[in-house]
Interface confidence: low
């Protein structure tokens, strides 16, 4: 039987006695920045090109012996996980290794930067097919490391990194915290986050997804036919690098944004036990375990969206938090969330020619998060329509009035410190699907977009008295683009999208003494692109 | 011993350089910042990445590095340029005393300086 980790990432349709998905990543070059490797190991022999690049610090300690097998152990194992003959993910992928970690597995930010520059230079000198760069390492947060990763990503390179093994917020580490890098946490055979001694996998909003990272069988540098089981977020990252190589082999024109959205889309959802994560990190940490797509085509013909959380605003009265989408993504909606419930809503703003989502803290609040819904939609053109506070009992309303524009998201922002309770009117008059409705004292912002064949509909789930959580999901074939709470009264902590489900959280009703007047609804905006569907059918 | 000789050679070159008249005057409104690793045991003081502003011309990296060496030499400090970056970020890697950071931050075109730090296999 195949190792558990390969089975876990393999859709049922591929599963046989052997793990042999199509194409095997053969059109892709994977760069591995790690320790030295044993290139004549039977798992990777002939598949790995050891570059002459080496930039490592001296080993610590006077009596440290550079025993080759020890020096090569980390890198050899990861090379095997990426493309090993027997136990690799992308058995056809070619590998190039750069040595940036010494025999003790230690390197420097500067040495790694020089390695990244070496890759960029190689790419300029001899452009090849798609490139994946695997960074199975972590240091403290580094502005320069993240900046270098951003530049390389913008040059069309896919970077995959380990979230880190510190049982901590991945945003405190680099390159894990770089938004352009695909950051991978580790899970085990039970879909539990991996524990490593007293520590374990990192977590939080800077993690993109998880992958198998415990008891991963792979090449051992002890001999040319030896295997060993190792654990860590490096192993998890190696799985995602392999999956990325497979996807890029099937669709070499994929951009980084498209690849990331596909990785998220094809992941197993909600299988990780979030109880392992600190309570304040659970909502921020993606509950996704990487998997290969079930098919090599058709993936491109759907509307892909993902949720991006901002950093925490901090508690000062006028603090704000900003969530941004990646370069090729469009911000289709913006929401906010505060654990204390004290917030002043959110709105979409333009910043440097790109739309961003900004959330506002309120007096006495512990801080807010902005939550952006970031989507891939060709030829999209979006604008924001705003209605100032209506003041009237019917609440504030705004709709998309431009021809051909559809509503993709609703946001509300208010200046008053406390909206107070507000019994909403009939939530939405029939026949006006392009309308946002909100509290009478709030400004309401409608995100209105035009794209070929784009159609959207509003779906609500309302309850007469607040519960801690109200959810509404989009049906199959539709993608959640917007998630908001109605009417946004003070007991609502906020709204956010989890996969294709809109979640509205309220304060624990047992402690707020709220009344049945305070109805709350989760409002989902579900979209699809007929244009993409038609293009897909033409290709079939 | 080898390292010291190397430093000395670079120092002599820097002293002979006539680049920019070796003026010490900082640019007006210089807002360069210094960054270092928040995890103290991972810090590697003595090696710094000097990052120049994004729009800086390629040739400016070498010129700024030489300028730093010359100004440091006048203050009696040895410096060593370990690497000049061209293909990802404009800037250079320099081995120098932390005493020179204030001087380096005032150089034209400098966006920020980051102290080197350790990374680890995961």
């Amino acid at each position: 039987s195949i190792p558990w980790n390969l089975e876990r990432i393999t859709p049922a349709r591929y599963r046989a006695d052997e793990y042999q998905p199509p194409k095997g990543g053969s059109l892709v070059e994977v760069y591995l920045l790690d320790t030295s490797i044993q290139s004549d190991h039977r798992e990777i022999e002939g598949r790995v090109m050891v570059t002459d690049f080496e930039s490592v610090p001296e080993e610590d300690g006077t009596r440290f012996h550079r025993q080759a097998s020890k020096c090569d152990s980390h890198g050899t194992h990861l090379a095997g996980v990426v493309s090993g003959r027997d136990a690799g993910v992308a058995k056809g992928a070619g590998l190039r290794s750069l040595r940036v970690l010494n025999c003790q597995g230690k390197g420097t930010v500067s040495g790694t930067l020089i390695g990244l520059e070496f890759i960029r230079k190689s790419q300029l000198v001899q452009p090849v097919g798609p490139l994946v760069v695997l960074l199975p390492l972590a240091g403290g947060y580094s502005r320069v490391f993240n900046a270098a990763c951003q530049r390389l990503a913008r040059a069309g390179v896919v970077l995959v990194t380990a979230a880190g093994n510190f049982r901590d917020d991945a945003c405190l580490y680099s390159p894990a915290s770089a938004p352009e890098v695909i950051t991978v946490g580790a899970t085990n055979a039970q879909d539990q986050p991996v524990t490593l001694g007293t520590l374990g996998t990192n977590f939080g909003r800077c993690v993109d997804l998880f992958a198998p990272g415990e008891d991963i069988i792979g090449a051992s540098s002890d001999c040319s036919t030896c295997f060993v089981s190792r654990s860590g977020t490096s192993q998890a990252a190696a799985h995602v690098a392999g999956i990325a190589a497979m996807m890029l082999s099937a669709e070499p024109e994929l951009t980084l944004a498209e690849l990331r959205q596909r990785l998220i889309h094809f992941s197993a959802k909600d299988v990780i036990n979030e109880a392992w994560f600190p309570e304040d990190q659970r909502v921020l940490t993606p509950n996704l375990v990487a998997a290969l797509p079930p098919s090599t085509h058709r993936a491109g013909w759907q509307l892909f969206c993902r949720t991006v959380w901002s950093a925490h605003s901090g508690p000062t009265r006028m603090a704000t938090a900003v969530a941004r989408c990646a370069q090729d993504e469009e911000l289709l909606s913006c929401s906010s969330f505060s654990r204390s419930g004290k917030r002043r809503g959110e709105r979409i703003e333009a910043q440097g020619g790109k739309r961003v989502c900004r959330a506002h803290n309120a007096f006495g609040g512990e801080g807010v998060y902005a939550i952006a819904r970031c989507c891939l939609l060709p030829q999209v053109n979006c604008s924001v329509h705003t209605a100032p506070p209506a003041g009237a009992s019917m609440g504030t309303r705004v709709h998309c009035h431009q021809q051909g524009h559809v509503l993709t998201g609703c946001s509300s922002h208010w200046e008053v410190e406390d909206l107070g309770t507000h019994k909403p009117p009939v939530l939405r008059p029939r026949g006006q699907p392009n309308q946002c409705v909100g509290h009478r004292e709030a400004s309401i912002h409608a995100s209105c977009c035009h794209a070929p064949g784009l159609e959207c509909k509003v779906k609500e789930h309302g309850i007469p008295a607040p519960q801690e959580q109200v959810i509404v999901a989009c049906e199959d074939g539709w993608t959640l683009t917007g998630c908001s709470a109605l009417p946004g009264t003070s007991h609502v902590l906020g709204a956010y999208a989890v996969d294709n489900t809109c979640v509205v959280r309220s304060r624990d009703v047992s402690t707020t003494g709220s009344t049945s007047e305070e109805a709350v609804a989760a409002v989902a905006i579900c979209c699809r692109s007929r244009h993409l569907v038609q293009a897909s059918q033409e290709l079939q | 011993q080898e390292d010291e000789d190397g430093d000395y050679e670079e120092l002599v070159l820097a002293l002979r350089s006539e680049e920019d008249g070796l003026a010490d005057a900082p640019e007006h409104g210089a807002t360069a910042t210094f960054h270092r690793c928040a995890k103290d045991p991972w810090r590697l003081p003595g090696t710094y990445v000097v990052v120049l502003k994004e729009e800086t011309h390629r040739s400016q990296s070498e010129r700024t590095a030489r300028r730093l060496q010359a100004q440091a030499a006048r203050r009696g400090y040895l410096t060593k340029i370990l690497h000049v970056f061209h293909h990802l970020l404009p800037g250079f890697l320099v081995k120098m005393s932390g005493d020179l950071l204030e001087l380096a931050l005032k150089l034209p075109h400098v966006d920020y300086i980051e102290e080197d730090s350790s990374v680890f296999a995961q």
């Epitope: 524990t195 909600d270 109880a275 309570e279 | -």
Partner: antibody, heavy 118, light 113 residues
């Protein structure tokens, strides 16, 4: 061997206090949430309290909230239940149970009897 | 709180025969996002602590004989022993772990007829 061993039970007067201990062995104690479950004589099972692997999160049944405190000592691989203001209805066998980390209990101790009587 | 109700309270079945115990929850314990029912079954023999038999409503704990099976979803669940053995005499409890407070059914006493 993977096991849990409870101790500290006994006879106590109403209003009194007692501290139960549960020694864990054979598994990585820090990785798992732990629970106390009790069973009154001849009755069914009644969940009392849970504590997360790190010890940072605790939950209690309403019937013991404010009177019982669950805690753990990672270095000693031991779970505790401090029981104050005991009542006759707290009389039961108290079991220590390892949590799968989802909320079901995949390993139980043999229990320790607590009798509250004047 | 989620109330768990088992039926019957007691059951007598002949050796080799099928035994069926039902459990009903006052609200659904199916978590839709991962399609798992947060329900377990335990066996408690006289003088012993309980022992986990089934979790996720239908997954057998390792070491549990395959004559034990669990089924059901949402609010209605069943534990089935396909061919009763003498050593199966015990009290059986269902438990929801969907949310705290975790709650157990009142128990079903299984005896040999």
């Amino acid at each position: 061997e993977v096991q849990l061993v409870e101790s500290g039970g006994g006879l106590v007067q109403p209003g009194g206090s007692l501290r139960l201990s549960c020694a864990a062995s054979g598994f990585t104690f820090n990785n798992y949430a732990m629970n106390w479950v009790r069973q009154a004589p001849g009755k069914g099972l009644d969940w009392v309290s849970t504590i997360s692997g790190s010890g940072g999160t605790t939950n209690y049944a309403d019937s013991v909230k404010g009177r019982f405190i669950i805690s753990r000592d990672s270095s000693k691989h031991t779970l505790y239940l401090q029981m104050n203001s005991l009542r006759a209805e707290d009389t039961a066998v108290y079991y220590c149970a390892k949590d799968s980390n989802w909320g079901n209990f995949d390993l139980w101790g043999r229990g320790t009897l607590v009798t509250v009587s004047s | 709180d989620i109330v768990m109700t088992q039926s019957p309270d007691s059951l007598a079945v002949s050796l080799g025969e099928r035994a069926t115990i039902n459990c009903k929850s006052s609200q659904s314990v199916l978590y839709r996002s991962n399609n798992r029912n947060f329900l377990g079954w335990y066996q408690q023999k006289p003088g012993q602590p309980p022992n986990l038999l089934i979790y996720w409503a239908s997954t057998r704990e390792s070491g549990v004989p395959d004559r034990f099976s669990g089924s059901g979803s949402g609010t209605d669940f069943t534990l089935t022993i396909s061919s009763l053995q003498a050593e199966d005499v015990a009290v059986y409890y269902c438990q929801q772990y969907y949310t705290t407070p975790y709650t157990f059914g009142q128990g079903t006493k299984l005896e040999i007829k």
